[in-house]
Interface confidence: low
């Protein structure tokens, strides 16, 4: 009864506290009743508030399980190749920018930017993406010229709905060359880089899709779309690979004013796509033609297209008019690459379900941080690696597939008691050797156990010491898939597990 | 077709705590989240939270922080929302309603509970 | 939290005439945001989601109901009031936690 009643206090004085708040009382007041709240607060007892606590991760995040580790390193390590046999160099910059770094560059979006609160110091702002840091890190050090890759978490106070994989911390991983090249080769090979990492994850179909922002921004013009209205009219545009275009329509007209005839205009234009052939088709457009902007846009697609046949890839790719990415940034081609669902009737397309990598050109950002203006041309591209993790984890899941949480070669094992010693110095051996070993924690462990161990944690080869064995200057090598077991002579061990992983010679 | 099937009315005294379920059917009840709103006798509706089943994940409104519990069961697919220290404003309505989703995250509610009257009275 | 501003508070159409509430939110600065939800209640009934989006027709609601505008002030509209759209109506924005609801709007016969 207590409790109850000094709960009820509590809940009057911070009532009391709210009322003197809306009544802009003054500072003095309010921290004086703030005060006398937090006493009664405390007098609640310590004990109660940690009852209270509900053990959780913060909203938006997740930790990883070893399982769900082990996808994530070699889902990176066959981007991070992908990225190195493409010459790129990596680098690193902080977790968090100066709030105006980040100030104005993501448009609408810019509200989702978590700012960290004042210390009296800085302004700072959780980084968005790794795309602004980049451009940051490009004029600050007065670089014109990189190529490099970039793998990091990144934060979005979005209210994400994870059962669906989003998050407000995600990994990115992104790829950008800077510098002033011949239009479209560095482009083309952006492109070549995404399908090459899409098909060696081997998480099923893809299409990428490309358009340009100058098309876009053209094609918006000669329907008639006022240039205030571009920006605001492209995020409507972006939403057809979810909703119909009568959808998109009344969206357009219903909410943001544009004419229906406009938007109409827009509408035979946005719902194409093709190849090659669409790119001339517009180029011969009796409107588009007269559009430098688009003009422009179309031309480096048709040289991009020639380059993409070269690398063998122009089949994964779809000039979509649709396509309006929405970040501000972009200034010129843009792609998005999406998984493909196959279809359920014959004739049907392929749909798609959900963006996996997406990128563009972005001449303008490091222009925008350079005192001078200047501006250096730059293209890339962003892995969405928590939607391939989550492919992956359900497929890993629905084939009920093993995967191994560690790189053990060798359990190191007794059979006898009162052979700690023994294990303790044949592991040290084979840690020294390079090799990945393990043993039980325990002075005389059953061999039972170490064997089960050995089994489920899915170790390939166990090495078993005996006393006779020990006589005998041997150890018993056993395999877990074959289940033979080998005399091996104490001082070619090292060899004999190398061999049978297939590892090449290392030290530590 | 999709349901949302509530507990009983209750009469709860002042400081105790009362539980309301909410059992889905018609639909995978590890897809969407369920929300709980109350409404308090001829009021508006005030939302109290929601819990994704799909990751036992839960979005709280800080006015209920403390006393408001929401659990699920996936096995029976059935959603749970607990109040504790109720007090004579707890009394209310309160529903239970299927987060509805379409372009990506914010929520409609599209499926409701019959509603669960609750009465705190000493 | 985001406070919802419903108007009017109740209003009185005749059958046939166009209906018009409107609900305004504070706080949501950008323009383009849409995430605004309409409810009909009826006495006795649970909510019934009516428009989803500012602008999006559930399925099954006649089409005489429609939402319209985007940033801080939407309405929603019945073109032709009749007997069973006597109720009261609520906006709801899922712009942030916590969701809110306007103060809601008694529609009524006149």
């Known amino acids: 009864a207590d409790r109850a009643a000094l709960e009820e206090l509590v809940r009057l004085q911070g009532a009391h506290v709210r009322g003197l708040k809306e009544q802009k009382a003054s500072a003095e007041q309010i921290e004086e009743e703030v005060t006398k709240l937090l006493k009664l607060k405390a007098q609640l007892g310590q004990d109660e508030g940690k009852q209270k606590f509900v053990l959780k991760t913060p909203k938006g995040t997740r930790d990883y399980s070893p399982r769900q580790m082990a996808v994530r390193e070699k889902v990176f390590d066959v981007i991070i190749r992908c990225f190195k046999r493409h010459g790129a160099e990596v680098i690193d910059t902080p977790v968090f920018e100066l709030k105006e770094t980040l100030t104005g560059k993501y448009g609408e979006d810019s509200k989702l930017i978590y700012d960290l609160k004042d210390q009296g110091g800085e302004l700072l702002s959780l980084r968005y993406d790794l795309t602004v840091p980049f451009a940051r890190y490009l004029a600050m050090n007065k670089l014109t010229n990189i190529k490099r890759y970039h793998i990091a978490k990144v934060y979005r106070r979005d209210n994400p709905a994870m059962t669906r994989g989003r998050y407000r911390e995600f990994y990115q991983c992104d790829f950008d060359i800077a510098g002033q090249f011949d239009p479209m080769i560095p482009d083309a090979e952006c492109l070549k880089i995404m399908c090459e990492i899409l098909s060696s994850l081997q998480i099923g179909n893809f299409l990428v899709k490309v358009n340009d922002r100058r098309i876009l921004d053209g094609m918006f013009a000669v329907c008639g779309v006022p240039d205030s209205k571009f920006r605001t009219i492209c995020s409507s545009v972006d939403k057809l690979d979810k909703v119909s275009w009568e959808e998109v329509k009344n969206e357009m007209v219903g909410e943001k004013g544009l004419a229906p005839e406009v938007a109409d205009r827009i509408g035979d234009y946005v719902q194409q796509h093709g190849g090659v052939s669409l790119v001339e088709q517009l180029l011969q457009d009796p409107k588009l033609s007269q559009n430098k902007q688009a003009v422009e846009g179309l031309g480096d697609l048709k040289l991009l297209f020639e380059y993409l046949i070269l690398f063998g890839i122009d089949d994964k790719i779809s000039f979509d008019l649709s396509l309006a990415r929405g970040l501000d940034y972009y200034t010129g081609v843009i792609y998005e690459a999406v998984l493909l669902q196959m279809p359920t009737q014959a004739g049907e397309e392929p749909l798609g379900v959900g963006s996996i990598a997406a990128g563009g050109r972005y001449d303008g950002l490091v222009g925008m941080f350079d005192p001078k203006g200047r501006k250096v041309p730059c293209v890339g591209l962003s892995i969405g690696v928590e939607r391939i993790f989550s492919i992956v984890e359900q497929r890993l899941e629905a084939s009920e597939e093993k995967v191994r949480t560690t790189e053990t070669q060798v359990l190191v094992a007794s059979a006898q008691k009162k052979l700690l010693e023994e294990r303790l110095k044949l592991v040290s051996e084979l840690w020294d050797a390079g090799i990945k070993a393990e043993l039980l924690y325990k002075k005389n462990p059953k061999l039972l156990n170490q064997l089960q161990y050995w089994e489920e944690a899915g170790i390939p080869l166990v090495a078993i010491i005996g006393e006779q064995e020990l006589r005998d200057g041997v150890i018993k090598l056993r395999s877990v898939a074959s289940r033979e077991e080998v005399d091996v002579r104490r001082e070619d061990l090292v060899e004999e597990i190398r061999r049978r992983t297939n590892q090449p010679l290392s030290t530590c | 077709q999709v349901q949302l099937v509530q507990s009983g009315a209750e009469v709860k005294k002042p400081g105790a705590s009362v539980k309301v379920s909410c059992k889905a059917s018609g639909y995978t009840f590890t897809d969407y989240c369920i929300g709980w709103i109350r409404q308090a006798p001829g009021q508006g509706l005030e939302w109290m939270g929601d819990i994704c089943p799909g990751d036992a994940y839960t979005n709280d409104n800080e006015k209920f922080k403390d006393r408001a519990t929401m659990t699920a069961d996936t096995s029976t697919s059935t959603a749970y929302m607990e109040l504790s220290s109720l007090r004579s404003e707890d009394t209310a309505v309160y529903y239970c309603?299927?987060?509805?989703?379409?372009?990506?995250?914010?929520?409609?509610?599209?499926?409701w509970g019959q509603g669960t009257s609750v009465t705190v009275s000493s | 939290d985001i406070v919802m501003t419903q108007s009017p508070d109740s209003l009185a159409v005749s059958l046939g005439e166009r209906a018009t509430i409107n609900c305004q939110s504070q706080s949501v600065s950008t323009s383009t945001y849409n995430y605004m939800h309409w409810y009909q209640q009826k006495p006795g009934q649970p909510p019934k989601l009516l428009i989803k989006y500012a602008s999006n027709l559930e399925s099954g609601v006649p089409d005489r109901f429609s939402g319209s505008g985007s940033g801080t002030d939407f309405t929603l509209t019945i073109s032709s009031l009749q007997a069973e759209d006597v109720a009261t109506y609520y906006c709801?924005?899922?712009?942030?936690?916590?969701?809110?609801f306007g103060g809601g709007t008694k529609l009524e016969i006149k």
């Open positions: 709801q924005h899922s712009w942030e936690i916590p969701w809110t």
């Open positions: 309603a299927r987060g509805e989703e379409q372009l990506g995250l914010r929520n409609a509610m599209d499926y």
